[in-house]
């Protein structure tokens, strides 16, 4: 591979590490790129034991601008020294580096969820992966926000054990024939900025429902 003098410094790449469906996903964007790379290779090492940079297997010569590092980055405390190389054909266009600490840099994307409206309650079904690595739990708590007619109520369901498998929460004591919107997100113990899901809304049916919210529980 030929190595032209890179026309991008570290400042030319913006990195983001996110917990998406409890997987560690590193994504990147390029600034001021005159030539768009045809592919990327991601390498890293751990600062505490600086060995040669290791190529991330599933992110070698990739055309995607993200990389799943769940199986590579297992510690929230370690500093991961990361290098992204961008190529056009056999020519290296640039090399960007950045250091990550998952405990500091990780942002938490909201889980997938569905809602089903009944006369006086809403079932919120939150989808978690079947298995979540212990180190990716991050002291997170699930928050379900219910909105109606400008009033926002926060629900913090208690989840026994790890956030894994599907989880159903019932928002009850609701008013029939009323529009309700629901958002879910993961909140960190230090109340750092959260990423809320888009709202999902439902108009509850009118009239009496024989089955009460209590028996639905």
């Amino acid at each position: 591979i030929s190595y032209d003098s890179p026309d991008y410094t570290d400042e030319s790449c913006t990195f983001k590490i996110s917990l998406r469906n409890f997987r560690s996903i590193l994504s990147w964007e390029l600034k001021n790129h005159s030539i768009v790379p045809t592919h990327y290779t991601l390498l890293y090492t751990i600062m505490s034991k600086p060995e040669d940079l290791k190529v991330v297997k599933n992110c070698a010569n990739t055309t995607r601008s993200f990389c799943d590092l769940t199986d590579e980055w297992r510690s929230t405390h370690e500093a991961y020294v990361t290098v992204l190389e961008g190529f056009s054909g056999n020519t290296t266009l640039f090399s960007c580096s950045h250091n990550f600490w998952l405990a500091i840099d990780m942002s938490f994307e909201p889980p997938e969820f569905e809602i089903v409206g009944f006369t006086n309650h809403i079932n919120v079904m939150v989808k978690f992966p079947s298995i979540v690595e212990e180190e990716l739990q991050f002291d997170l708590s699930l928050v379900i926000e219910e909105q109606s007619e400008g009033i926002v109520k926060k629900h913090k369901p208690e989840i026994k054990g790890n956030m894994s498998g599907n989880f159903t929460y019932i928002i009850d004591k609701l008013i029939p024939n009323t529009n309700y919107c629901v958002s879910v997100y993961l909140e960190h113990s230090d109340e750092q900025a959260v990423i809320k899901s888009p709202l999902k809304c439902t108009l509850l049916p009118p009239g009496q429902e024989s089955e009460s919210a209590e028996s639905a529980k």
Epitope: T76, A79, S189, Q192
Partner: antibody, heavy 119, light 112 residues
């Protein structure tokens, strides 16, 4: 060699704010975390928060959220901590420290900045 | 928050004699990555704090080998085999395993 040079002592009025600086030298500023710690006389230190100067990402101790604001200026290799709505409880020595290798490992410390809140 | 309890509060020693400081945490400091993020620092009067030990037992460069750190789980110890005058000051343990990081109340090492 690694050095963290903090700004000088401050005497400030209650209700005002103060900005403490921490200038790093002897290493690549954006490659390491900067932590901030509060120490009142005769007490153990309290952790305020941490910033990654490379990304600008921050984590605060919930106790100091809304009280402390951490920032970093890459061009001058300087980290800042602003303390707002000061009361006598904020009178303390504030330290910045560098993290190498691990979050929370704080291998080099600044000399401390004394903040006295008094009317 | 994890509570770090140091004993004794004050330790009066003779130069050349050994010293031992205990640090106990309210919950285990063993992280899911297999490491224990327990550190020790020394604060001499009028000086910046100086880290001595990290990851329970790893000595920082320039720290004399008369210092040793040991322990696991919730119980940790800092030992000085033969105290020298430059060792006097306040010693703090702190943990970085759990959020937020927390410090012990300190142990003052002074001359008898």
């Amino acid at each position: 060699q690694v050095q963290l040079q903090q700004s000088g002592a401050e005497l400030v009025r209650p209700g005002t704010s103060v900005k403490v600086s921490c200038k790093a030298s002897g290493y690549a500023f954006t490659n390491y975390l900067i932590e901030w710690v509060k120490q009142r006389p005769g007490q153990g230190p309290e952790w305020i928060g941490v910033i990654n100067p490379g990304s600008g990402n921050i984590r605060y101790n919930g106790k100091f959220k809304g009280k402390a604001t951490l920032t970093a200026d890459k061009s001058s290799s300087t980290a800042y901590m602003q303390l707002s709505s000061l009361t006598s409880d904020d009178s303390a020595v504030y330290f910045c420290a560098r993290d190498a290798y691990y979050v929370g490992a704080m291998d080099y410390w600044g000399q401390g900045t004394s903040v006295t809140v008094s009317s | 928050d994890v509570v770090m309890t140091q004993t004794p509060l004050t330790l009066s020693v003779t130069i050349g004699q050994p010293a031992s400081i205990s640090c106990k945490s309210s919950q285990s400091l063993l992280d899911s990555d297999g490491k224990t993020y327990l550190n020790w620092l020394l604060q001499r009067p009028g000086q910046s704090p100086k880290r001595l030990i990290y990851l329970v037992s790893k000595l920082d460069s320039g720290v004399p080998d008369r210092f040793t750190g040991s322990g696991s789980g919730t119980d940790f110890t800092l030992k000085i085999s033969r105290v020298e005058a430059e060792d006097l000051g306040v010693y703090y343990c702190w943990q970085g395993t759990h959020f937020p990081q927390t410090f012990g109340g300190g142990t003052k090492l002074e001359l008898k």
